[in-house]
Each structure stands twice: as structure tokens, then as C-alpha cells.
């Protein structure tokens, strides 16, 4: 869902402390829980009534270098007969995520957080119904 | 989807450069594209044929402090009559995302990346059929 803006206090030292030099912070090497992995049912992107395809974007100066984006295959949803039902809608489910951007000049390497919108998959929804007033 | 393991080269300096002191790196303040927000249709979590609820977790030493997790409401999917159809399955769609963990001792503040599994929503799938051998 939503990632808050960084302009306020999270990355600042307590007011009683000297400010961070040079507008940068200390990022410890290593990732907590780096071995966690998504375990989703097999081929849900094809078995879903709102199926989707994946596109992989690759950037060697981004961590993770690989970011996978989903695209809904249909406007409608797939019914029990395998046909598209346009009385229902396939809609994307999005998520805000953080990646790390690497910037280097010679031996000087720094990193910066970047917010990325990722479409994770699709779901089938009923359209908004208007009741006559 | 999946975030690769960080143990290799992304956060390392080139081999010809002196190593990073104290096992930490320089993280620039500010977030690229920090104003981006997910725009989704209203109430897709309730209008979906595989509806879900949201739970907000809050941690002041994590960025973002708010992390929203979805939980599928049903095992089956909701049919056109608004009844649960157990011949189909509601399944969670998960995403690996990065958050930043803040660690402080007095005026010494450091940060570390952490991998978090987020359930973003649910989708309705046809179950895998196992044929008797």
C-alpha cells in the first residue's frame, strides 16, 4: 500500500544530537530476513479468473536489480467455460515498494532509497452498480 | 515477487578500491519518487470475487512505519449470486518488499535494510486438479 514521505523525522537524529554530516546516513551492510521468500500457489497468474503476464525489468544499479511487473491479460474475467465475461473487470493490484539506487564516481559509492510502484497481480471485481434514484 | 540475496556484489566497492570501513555504507538522505502513491479503484478489496480485509501494522523504528497486510476472507470465491463457491479458491498475492530498520544508541543512529513479505490482495483461481494415476 502506501509508503510515507521521508521529509519528517524518521531519518533525522534526535534534536539534541549534532546533525548528520553531508546529508547522508550510515547503512549497515546485510539484509535482515534476506532468506525470506514468497511462497505462492503454482501458476496463479495463469489459473486466476483475472489472469496476468509478467514483465521483468533489469537495472544493475538498482537493488533488487530485477523488478517484476504484472499486466492483466483481459479487461473482463474468465468464466467457468474459459470465456471472457465483460460483466466483470480484471483490475491490477499495486504495491509501493522500496528499492536501493547505487550511485558511483570512481571509488566513491553512495546509495539512495527509491520508491517504485509494482503491479503484483490482478483480481476480478464486480463493477460499481448504480441503483436508480 | 522475489528479491535476490545481497551477499554478492551490489553493496561492495570495486575490487581495486579500499574496503568499506566498519561494515557500513553511505545512504543519501531523501527518497527518489517519494511522492508516488498507488491509485486503485475504490473498494476493490470488497468488490473482488476473492475479497480480503486489511490489517495495518505500525512500527516507529521501521520505514515505512505503516505496513498493510491483506487477509483473504474466504477459502472459496464469491459467485454472481454473492455466495461462496468452494469449487474455486481465493489465494493471497504476495510481494517481497524492502523496509528500513532504524537502530539507535544515544546519538549514534544506523539503518539496515530488511526484507518483508507483504500480502497485497487476493485473486480467485481454479484449483489444481490431480488426476489419479
Amino acid at each position: 500500500r502506501k509508503i510515507p514521505k521521508v521529509g519528517h523525522t524518521f531519518f533525522q537524529k534526535p534534536e539534541s544530537c549534532p546533525p548528520v554530516p553531508g546529508g547522508s546516513m550510515k547503512l549497515d551492510i546485510g539484509i535482515i530476513n534476506e532468506n525470506q521468500r514468497v511462497s505462492m500457489s503454482r501458476n496463479i497468474e495463469s489459473r486466476s479468473t483475472s489472469p496476468w503476464n509478467y514483465t521483468v525489468t533489469w537495472d544493475p544499479n538498482r537493488y533488487p536489480s530485477e523488478v517484476v511487473q504484472a499486466q492483466c491479460r483481459n479487461l473482463g474475467c474468465i468464466n467457468a467455460q474459459g470465456k471472457e465475461d465483460i460483466s466483470m473487470n480484471s483490475v491490477p493490484i499495486q504495491q509501493e515498494t522500496l528499492v536501493v539506487r547505487r550511485k558511483h564516481q570512481g571509488c566513491s559509492v553512495s546509495f539512495q532509497l527509491e520508491k517504485v510502484l509494482v503491479t503484483v497481480g490482478c483480481t476480478c471485481v464486480t463493477p460499481v452498480i448504480h441503483h436508480v434514484q | 515477487r522475489k528479491i535476490p540475496k545481497v551477499g554478492h556484489t551490489f553493496f561492495q566497492k570495486p575490487e581495486s578500491c579500499p574496503p568499506v570501513p566498519g561494515g557500513s555504507m553511505k545512504l543519501d538522505i531523501g527518497i527518489i519518487n517519494e511522492n508516488q502513491r498507488v491509485s486503485m479503484s475504490r473498494n476493490i478489496e470488497s468488490r473482488s470475487t476473492s475479497p480480503w480485509n486489511y490489517t495495518v501494522t505500525w512500527d516507529p523504528n521501521r520505514y515505512p512505519s505503516e505496513v498493510v497486510q491483506a487477509q483473504c476472507r474466504n477459502l472459496g470465491c464469491i459467485n454472481a449470486q454473492g455466495k461462496e463457491d468452494i469449487s474455486m479458491n481465493s489465494v493471497p498475492i504476495q510481494q517481497e518488499t524492502l523496509v528500513v530498520r532504524r537502530k539507535h544508541q544515544g546519538c549514534s543512529v544506523s539503518f539496515q535494510l530488511e526484507k518483508v513479505l507483504v500480502t497485497v490482495g487476493c485473486t480467485c483461481v481454479t484449483p489444481v486438479i490431480h488426476h489419479v494415476q
Epitope: K2 | S41, R42, S65, E66
Partner: antibody, heavy 118, light 107 residues
Framework: EVQLLESGGGLVQPGGSLRLSCAAS????????MNWVRQAPGKGLEWVST????????YYADSVKGRFTISRDNSKNTLYLQMNSLRAEDTAVYYC???????????WGQGTTVTVSS | EIVLTQSPATLSLSPGERATLSCRAS??????LAWFQQKPGQAPRLLIY???NRATGIPARFSGSGSGTDFTLTISSLEPEDFAVYYC?????????FGQGTKVEIK
């Protein structure tokens, strides 16, 4: 019934400060992001700022960033906008607006007028 | 930022006539477009959200259509209380932006 009532507007000199409030009722305040939107005299609408339900997520228009601060007190069902270093171009009617989805402004208050003039 | 251009700037019509208001976006906003009505001295009132969905309590004579960059608000038969300024607004990208407005006035 959703109700939003702004207060705190008035006449202030350039460089001065003002704090606007918006009292909310008729919905679960802490579950919704809230916004400030302004309208200069005889002009169109301009989004100013957003704060998420728990206050962890904050967004500003470039025109007010660094001068305005949005906040909320969920125990009082109240939204605030602290406006510092005010300029003549900040003169406007300021509306608070409830958000149903991302920047989906479904209910608005009646507005409070801010005039910046010497 | 996404620029929304509304046309015409003013629409002079009589009660009972059909009003067609246009809003064009400088880039695609998918279906994330709303329409508001504003009368003098009053707050904006949400009419249509997500391009084509009527907000709670809005009469059926108001309808919205379009997706991508071109959107239309239609008032099928103008009532005396419909004479007002109408704004479109996109929520697809930061910052959310509004059109400059179309004034619907009595002919």
C-alpha cells in the same frame, strides 16, 4: 452524516503564520487519509497536502513544501495545517477533504478564508 | 505534472437542454478522473469518481465517460440547480491536479 468544519483562517501579514483546523465527524476519522485543497479568489482548485490515517504518510505540493506542515490528532478527530512564511499567493479559501481512495476527495468542508496582505 | 484542459470555458444553455463538458489530460490517467460541481460560496461536491461512477446521492441525469486522456461529463437534461462551475480532477499521478473549470450558465 459526514461533516467537516474548518476554522482558523484570517488576515495575516506576509511572512506570518496561521494554523488551520478541521473538525471531523460522522466517520471513523483514523481510517481515512485527509487533505487540504485551496482555491484562490476567482481561480480553480489546487491540492495542498495529504496525511494518511495514522499520520505516517505525508505529501505536499511543491508550492508549499518546507513552509506548511500537515498533522492530525485522531483522539480529537481533528486535522491541522500549520502555515508559516506566508506569501500573498497563499491567499485562498482552504478546504479540508476526506479521501476515500488515493486523492479521491469524496467529502469537503465549507472552507476557511486565509488572506495574506500587508 | 498532468495538465487537465476543460472545454468549453463557458457553456450557455437553457433548462431542459443537454450539457456536454469535456476534459482532456496531457497524458493518460487511466480511469482515475473525477468531476466536481461548485456553486458560488460553496464547497465543491463530488459528482463522478473513477470516470463513470456516480457518487452517493447524485441524480442519474449526471453521467461520466472516457478513459486515458479524453473524458466527458454529460447532464442529460439541465435542472435550474445545475447551473454552476464544473471541475475535473485526476488522481493517477502526483500531484493530483484539477482542470480550470467549465461554467454552465443560463442562456
Amino acid at each position: 452524516e459526514v461533516q467537516l468544519l474548518e476554522s482558523g483562517g484570517g488576515l495575516v501579514q506576509p511572512g506570518g503564520s496561521l494554523r488551520l483546523s478541521c473538525a471531523a465527524s460522522g466517520f471513523t476519522f483514523s481510517s481515512y487519509a485527509m487533505n487540504w485543497v485551496r482555491q484562490a479568489p476567482g481561480k480553480g482548485l489546487e491540492w495542498v497536502s495529504t496525511i494518511s490515517g495514522r499520520g505516517g504518510s505525508i505529501y505536499y505540493a511543491d508550492s508549499v513544501k518546507g513552509r506548511f506542515t500537515i498533522s492530525r490528532d485522531n483522539s480529537k478527530n481533528t486535522l491541522y495545517l500549520q502555515m508559516n512564511s506566508l506569501r500573498a499567493e497563499d491567499t485562498a479559501v482552504y478546504y479540508c477533504a476526506k479521501e476515500e481512495a488515493t486523492w479521491d476527495f469524496d467529502y469537503w468542508g465549507q472552507g476557511t478564508t486565509v488572506t495574506v496582505s500587508s | 505534472e498532468i495538465v487537465l484542459t476543460q472545454s468549453p470555458a463557458t457553456l450557455s444553455l437553457s433548462p431542459g437542454e443537454r450539457a456536454t463538458l469535456s476534459c482532456r489530460a496531457s497524458q493518460s490517467v487511466s480511469s482515475f478522473l473525477a468531476w466536481f460541481q461548485q456553486k458560488p460560496g460553496q464547497a465543491p461536491r463530488l459528482l463522478i469518481y473513477d470516470a463513470s461512477n456516480r457518487a452517493t446521492g447524485i441524480p442519474a441525469r449526471f453521467s461520466g465517460s472516457g478513459s486515458g486522456t479524453d473524458f466527458t461529463l454529460t447532464i442529460s437534461s439541465l435542472e435550474p440547480e445545475d447551473f454552476a462551475v464544473y471541475y475535473c480532477q485526476q488522481r493517477s499521478n502526483w500531484p493530483p491536479t484539477f482542470g480550470q473549470g467549465t461554467k454552465v450558465e443560463i442562456k
